[in-house]
């Protein structure tokens, strides 16, 4: 088992996440990737995924989740805007490889969003915002669900958990349909 | 604990080739992106180069870019820094550095080496 | 490339006083922004990431704030082991990643 660590960031109401996860470029750069919500004793929860394949820095939306996968560089942009304290939890990048479990990238997510506005005289706390306004092309996506009994995921007490990832087979056959809309910037 | 150490510092006359090595432990080394940092004498800090958790995508400063080349080995946990036609602006300590799981900053830093590029 | 510029150069504190280092980017950055304390003769050391979040072991008197494009580093109540110089970083995205010229904070 792999040492799974935390990051932790602290946000308030209405400014944005802006994580990026770091991949295996020659391995996962069309593979669909996702972003996932773990709750204490339930599985990994997929919030938004990329195109399948996934296409290279080609922005998907899903709510107020953006997801920006570059395959050059190997790295998926994770924008979650307009942030809500109940936004609070611990989120998680995956890589989906059937029929292998979804492969984790480092590290998991602490986020913790207060009430509250700290912005400073000057300071721009919309600006990535804005340029989501511009009206949206929607398509239809199907995220897969994670649904193998032995990946029910305990919330680690602490601020590292022993996360493995075995190569058993997963049922895809439950599947979401998720409203996946491109954004241009 | 996360612990860096830098070795291969030293002399070395401007046109020269140095190489510097970066032992890792104390988390996933493959896990995390790692990069050089450098620091002028009595300057401030510049970023240098970075290499993905893989070794599938690197990055380079402009100031480096053909003259420098880092590489991993993730077997052994270590980072390297090939540095080819050295220049007199090149003498810094040179700081290896782990990135963060989530972002391209620093969580994680070396002591650092001294190279000097003097004839 | 994304131009941070770091003010006032050199701060003149009193232990005890509070501290408050800026820094500005040359274009939004969103909170993409870390903070590095480094001392004379040591390797830097991370205090603050996101523009607001504490790095692991950072005492809560260093606070970060801002966003966009104004950032700002403060230090409540100076510590004698505070007095050293500051750099802010920026990683919005792609290399490179810039850092700020810095600012020495030294005892009034």
């Known amino acids: 088992a792999t040492k799974l660590t935390e990051e932790k960031y602290e946000l308030k109401e209405g400014q944005t996440l802006d994580v990026k996860c770091d991949y295996t470029l020659e391995k996962f750069a069309s593979s669909q990737k996702a972003w996932q919500i773990i709750r204490d004793g339930e599985m990994p929860k997929t919030l938004a995924c990329t195109e399948r394949p996934s296409k290279n820095s080609h922005p998907v939306q899903v709510g107020r989740i953006i997801l920006e996968d570059y395959h050059d560089h190997g790295l998926l942009r994770v924008r979650m805007v307009n942030l809500q304290v109940e936004d609070s939890g611990l989120y998680q990048c995956v890589i989906y490889q059937p029929p292998k479990e979804p492969h984790m990238l480092f590290d998991r997510i602490r986020l913790v969003v207060t009430k509250g506005f700290s912005g400073t005289p000057g300071s721009n706390e919309n600006s990535t915002q804005n340029v989501y306004k511009i009206p949206p092309t929607t398509t239809k996506a199907l995220c897969p669900l994670y649904t193998s009994p032995r990946t029910v995921t305990q919330a680690p007490p602490k601020s590292t958990a022993d996360v493995s990832t075995p190569d058993s087979e997963i049922n895809l056959t439950n599947v979401t349909d998720i409203i996946r809309v491109p954004v241009f910037n | 604990e996360v612990q860096l150490l830098e070795s291969g510092g030293g002399l070395v006359q401007p046109g020269g080739s140095l190489r510097l090595s970066c032992a890792a432990s104390?988390?996933?080394?493959?896990?995390?992106?790692m990069s050089w940092v450098r620091q002028a004498p009595g300057k401030g800090l510049e970023w240098v180069s970075t290499?993905?958790?893989?070794?599938?995508?690197?990055y380079y400063a402009d100031s480096v870019k053909g003259r420098f080349t880092i590489s991993r080995d993730n077997s052994k946990n270590t980072l390297d820094l090939q540095m080819n036609s050295l220049r007199a602006e090149d003498t810094a300590v040179y700081y290896c550095?782990?990135?963060?799981?989530?972002?391209?900053?620093?969580?994680?830093w070396g002591q650092g080496t001294l190279v000097t590029v003097s004839s | 490339e994304i131009v941070m510029t770091q003010s006032p150069a050199t701060l003149s504190v009193s232990p005890g006083e509070r501290a408050t280092l800026s820094c500005r980017a040359s274009?939004?950055?969103?909170?993409?922004l870390a903070w590095y304390q480094q001392k004379p003769g040591q390797a830097p050391r991370l205090l603050i990431y996101?523009?607001?979040t504490r790095a692991t072991g950072i005492p809560d008197r260093f606070s970060g704030s801002g966003s966009g494009t104004e950032f700002t580093l403060t230090i409540s109540s100076l510590q004698s082991e505070d007095f050293a110089v500051y750099y802010c970083?920026?990683?919005?995205?792609?290399?490179?990643?810039?850092f700020g010229q810095g600012t020495k904070v030294e005892i009034k």
């Open positions: 550095a782990k990135v963060a799981g989530s972002n391209f900053f620093f969580d994680h």
């Open positions: 104390g988390f996933t080394f493959n896990a995390y992106a």
């Open positions: 290499i993905s958790g893989s070794g599938s995508t690197t």
């Open positions: 274009q939004s950055i969103n909170h993409n």
């Open positions: 996101g523009a607001y």
């Open positions: 970083q920026e990683f919005i995205l792609f290399p490179p990643w810039t």
